[in-house]
């Protein structure tokens, strides 16, 4: 994250780390906890890393400097990446993890509200996107979760900064003008969150950008409102019954 | 699967004109960077020219711009080149080209994922 | 424009032996606007690495890319009969997007 400050304990309970185990272990994601046994991420944090066994997901974590090897941690039963993604393309850039076991809730450790199917119509005011990851686009990762504050901006306005590139209907995007906040690398696939009546909705997963908080380049998500039935379908068959918390 | 398809090559004088068509098949052609790449005989690669997804934003390479105009038709799933002021240097085998643009740590990538048979244009007198 | 330099010109290799191929750039470029492509004789070029050192679908693990900034390598552990061609480094980090020289690989 640019331009954000740290967060605290309890503040963001749906947000997990996706790291992956070979020689070292390294954050390489983020996720976003909405079930007992789901997180939902991004497609492209599994290009060329699509076995189960190496990734450790780490959930109700603030620093990861805190992570021992000690440290619980859940692995990952089943990686659903989206049927249209394409490692060539931007679009569908979403992707469920079924997790071994379920994991309880804390004040730590607790879902995120996904939005209505099909939500065009509630207007956002307040977003905030939050990682992991570095916080210049030549940095490194960060160990205490970081949070920002970042606009929407419309589709319309976005496609003209990136006139080179297709967003999609099923993109959403957030930043300044003048940039200098914005997620980066390593805060793919975490979370977009907007407070509206009160509650929290997981309104984006962290996708691309050019660079990181430059100027007239706003950040890229996937826009989880136009995944609801497939979040739905695939939670449902897997599960049988659906375990997502849902808008009230 | 992806097929890239060039046709309109051909023997031009100097100065004439030639309008290069790629037909594409097997992907969603409307979400997909296109370009052109030339390939003179016996030599190396050269990009001429490339076009957004909507076609409103158009690069060219400073040897052909003024000349050269890509464009294409989403309805059509083709993509073209209308070639103007032909000169000698641009007798090569023309390739149409999607650009993959995938997403790797939160950047997006570029490359050239698919190409065409390719086109031979030769302008001679 | 950015200019990109394959070294070498010609590399003339047994078939089993480890080709390492150099690509310089003239300025920084960013490793996600990096490829490789190989041509043989009268086909058209087929994309090897792209992101510098992500392989293309269907590309054997043979073939290897890395590298960052200005300096960057294709490699291919053990050469294949098939493997004899040219290869071409590529960036589209900025525009004029620009091509290496090529490296002919050629059987010794």
């Known amino acids: 994250i640019v331009g954000g400050t740290n967060s605290s304990w309890g503040e963001w309970p749906w947000q997990v780390s996706l790291q992956v185990k070979l020689t070292a272990q390294r954050h390489l994601c983020g996720g976003s906890l909405i079930g007992h046994q789901w997180v939902l991420t991004a497609a492209h944090c599994f290009d060329g890393l699509p076995l189960q066994d190496v990734w450790r997901i780490y959930s109700g974590i603030l620093n990861l400097s805190d992570i021992t090897k000690d440290t619980p941690f859940s692995q990952i039963k089943e990686i659903i990446i989206h049927q249209n993604y394409k490692v060539s393309e931007g679009n569908h850039d979403i992707a469920l993890i079924k997790l071994q076991a379920p994991l309880n809730y804390t004040e730590f450790q607790k879902p995120i509200c996904l939005p209505s199917k099909g939500d065009t119509s509630t207007i956002y005011t307040n977003c905030w996107v939050t990682g992991w990851g570095f916080s210049k686009e030549k940095g490194e990762i960060q160990n205490i979760l970081q949070k920002v504050n970042i606009p929407l901006v419309t589709n319309e306005e976005c496609q003209k900064a990136y006139a080179d590139a297709k967003i999609a209907q099923a993109m959403v995007c957030a930043g300044y003008k003048e940039g200098g906040k914005d997620a980066c690398k390593g805060d793919s696939g975490g979370p977009l969150v907007c407070k509206h009546n009160g509650m929290w909705r997981l309104v984006g997963i962290t996708s691309w950008g050019e660079g990181c908080a430059r100027r007239e380049q706003p950040g890229v998500y996937t826009k989880v409102a136009e995944y609801m039935d497939w979040i739905l379908e695939k939670t449902q068959s897997s599960d049988g019954k659906a375990q997502m918390q849902s808008p009230a | 699967e992806v097929q890239l398809l060039e046709s309109g090559g051909g023997l031009v004088q100097p100065g004439g004109s030639l309008r290069l068509s790629c037909a594409a098949s097997?992907?969603?052609?409307?979400?997909?960077?296109m370009t052109w790449v030339r390939q003179a005989p016996g030599k190396g690669l050269e990009w001429v020219s490339y076009?957004?997804?909507?076609?409103?934003?158009?690069i060219y390479a400073d040897s052909v711009k003024g000349r050269f105009t890509i464009s294409r038709d989403n309805s059509k799933n083709t993509l073209y080149l209308q070639m103007n002021s032909l000169r000698a240097e641009d007798t090569a085998v023309y390739y149409c080209?999607?650009?993959?643009?995938?997403?790797?740590?939160?950047?997006?990538?570029?490359?050239?994922?698919?190409w065409g048979q390719g086109t031979l244009v030769t302008v001679s007198s | 424009e950015i200019v990109l330099t394959q070294s070498p010109g010609t590399l003339s290799l047994s078939p089993g032996e480890r080709a390492t191929l150099s690509c310089r750039t003239s300025?920084?470029?960013?490793?996600?606007?990096l490829a490789w492509y190989q041509q043989k004789p009268g086909q058209a070029p087929r994309l090897l690495i792209y992101g510098a050192s992500s392989r293309a679908t269907g590309i054997p693990d043979r073939f290897s890319g890395s590298g960052s900034g200005t300096d960057f390598t294709l490699t291919i552990s053990r050469l294949e009969p098939e493997d004899f061609a040219v290869y071409y480094c590529q960036q589209s980090s900025r525009t004029p997007w620009t091509f290496g020289q090529g490296t002919k690989v050629e059987i010794k």
């Open positions: 097997g992907f969603t052609f409307s979400h997909y960077l």
């Open positions: 300025q920084f470029v960013n490793s996600n606007y």
């Open positions: 080209a999607m650009v993959g643009q995938g997403i790797r740590g939160r950047s997006r990538t570029s490359y050239f994922a698919q």
């Open positions: 076009i957004s997804p909507s076609g409103g934003h158009t």
